[in-house]
């Protein structure tokens, strides 16, 4: 149902990653205005973004309240200019999402090196533990707050004069490894989410070397 | 649902190469890394090395580097091993495996790899 | 590299008896330690990851317990189908290596 002059959005899609959550759709409008509303699957629906005229829609705030529930969005799309217009069914015309899960969905954001310090033998490599959204008695949790020992990185390393690579794995956001003595390491990070079926992996940190200001080097 | 399905088996001459390949379904690989496992006559279980098909890195066991190349083709969702240099003790069933960062949690059912003059 | 030291090599045992085999790492692992169970002219089958969580369809009666570098693997009831080979794997750094293996057979 709908008025004659309205199209129902379509292509409703989730773009998330580390909790930042926007609903995007389709059309562009052309004389009609959208708004959005969510709920989770057992709850009230919560109207956001007022009869606008974008195609996306930020729904963090909403999503961040519980990042372990099922939610629900949809779109409603009004005449321009005629916002209490309903169709023949008494309501305006909407769309709804698929469900989206925030915990088992978002992206897993590109990762960053923070530091690396080398003594002696041993590389300690430290990936940053990214702020999210997410908050708990009005602070922001990092991604490692939110997911726990759900989240591993894995660590790809080189001699920066050769090809062969090594990997480790960790449950924290430091890595301890061997390296050999008088060679210059290149790294790179990648964050995993194990237990998921989807939106596993993150991307590649950018690759960190050794010999560059980011690290720091100590004889021992 | 998980499968691995792993090329037939080889009879190869020593000093000469083989290339063995396992086709993936029922996931995505760039989403896991994946592994090849060596496994002689009556003995243990070998890793030979495992490639991450989202960025392209390998990585090798230091006793194969060099003879060994593992590479993975996300269109065909098929991750390929080849040895070079064959010698007699390369005769083993080889596995491959998916890791999902937490185990090998499924494998194929080996390819046999007979090397012998 | 990490050496993996599994024990004991072979064990004889009954059904009904409870079996354990442990693994013990040269360096810590964090966890990163997962079982296989291995039949004759078959692929491994994957039993325990992340050092103590049963993957699916297996069996109750395995259970995996340890951390740092000392893992166990515990066969509470043991069973027909369970006379097989077991093999740890430590994949917390490269090259990723396995235990020696245990052979259960039946007393």
């Known amino acids: 149902s709908g008025t004659t002059n309205t199209v129902a959005a379509y292509n409703l899609t989730w773009k998330s990653t580390n909790f930042k959550t926007i609903l995007e759709w389709e059309p562009k409008p052309v004389n009609q205005v959208y708004t959005v509303q969510i709920s989770t699957k057992s709850g009230d629906w919560k109207s956001k973004c007022f009869y606008t005229t974008d195609t996306e829609c930020d729904l963090t705030d909403e999503i961040v309240k519980d990042v372990k529930q099922t939610y629900l969005a949809r779109v409603f799309s009004y005449p321009a200019g005629n916002v209490e217009s309903t169709g023949s069914a008494g309501e305006p015309l909407y769309e709804n999402s698929p469900e989206f899960t925030p915990y088992l969905e978002t992206n897993l954001g590109q990762p960053t090196i923070q530091s690396f310090e080398q003594v002696g033998t041993k590389v300690n490599v430290t990936v940053e533990d990214e702020r999210t959204l997410v908050r708990r008695n009005n602070t922001f949790l990092s991604l490692r707050d939110v997911f726990g020992k759900d989240l591993i990185y894995t660590l790809y390393y080189w001699k920066s004069s050769s090809s062969g690579k090594k990997t480790a794995k960790t449950n924290t956001n430091e890595f301890l490894i061997d390296v050999d003595k008088g060679e210059n390491y290149c790294f790179s990070v990648q964050a995993v989410i194990p237990s998921r079926t989807v939106n596993r992996k993150s991307t590649d940190s950018p690759v960190e070397c050794m010999g560059q200001e980011k690290g720091e080097f100590r004889e021992i | 649902q998980v499968q691995l399905l792993e090329s037939g088996a080889v009879l190869a001459r020593p000093g000469t190469s083989v290339k063995i390949s396992c086709k993936a379904s029922g996931f995505n690989i760039k989403d896991y890394y994946m592994h090849w496992v060596k496994q002689r006559p009556g003995q243990g279980l070998e890793w030979i090395g495992g490639?991450?098909?989202?960025?392209?890195?390998?990585m090798y066991d230091p006793k194969f580097q060099g003879r060994v190349t593992i590479t993975a083709d996300t269109s065909t969702s098929t991750v390929f091993m080849e040895l070079s240099s064959l010698r007699s003790e390369d005769t083993a069933v080889y596995y491959c495996?998916?890791?999902?960062?937490?185990?090998?949690?499924?494998w194929g059912q080996g390819t046999l790899v007979t090397v012998s003059s | 590299d990490i050496q993996m030291t599994q024990s004991p090599s072979s064990l004889s045992a009954s059904v009904g008896d409870r079996v354990t085999i442990t693994c013990k790492a040269s360096q810590d692992i964090k966890s990163f330690l997962s079982w296989y169970q291995q039949k004759p002219e078959k692929a491994p089958k994957s039993l325990i990851y992340?050092?103590?969580s049963l993957a699916d369809g297996v069996p109750s009666r395995f259970s995996g317990s340890g951390s740092g570098t000392d893992y166990t693997l515990t066969i509470s009831s043991l069973q027909p189908e369970d006379f097989a080979t077991y093999y740890c794997l430590q994949h917390g750094e490269s090259p990723y290596t396995f235990g020696g293996g245990t052979k259960v057979e039946i007393k």
């Open positions: 490639n991450d098909p989202a960025n392209g890195h390998s």
């Open positions: 495996a998916r890791d999902s960062g937490y185990a090998m949690d499924y």
């Open positions: 992340y050092a103590t």
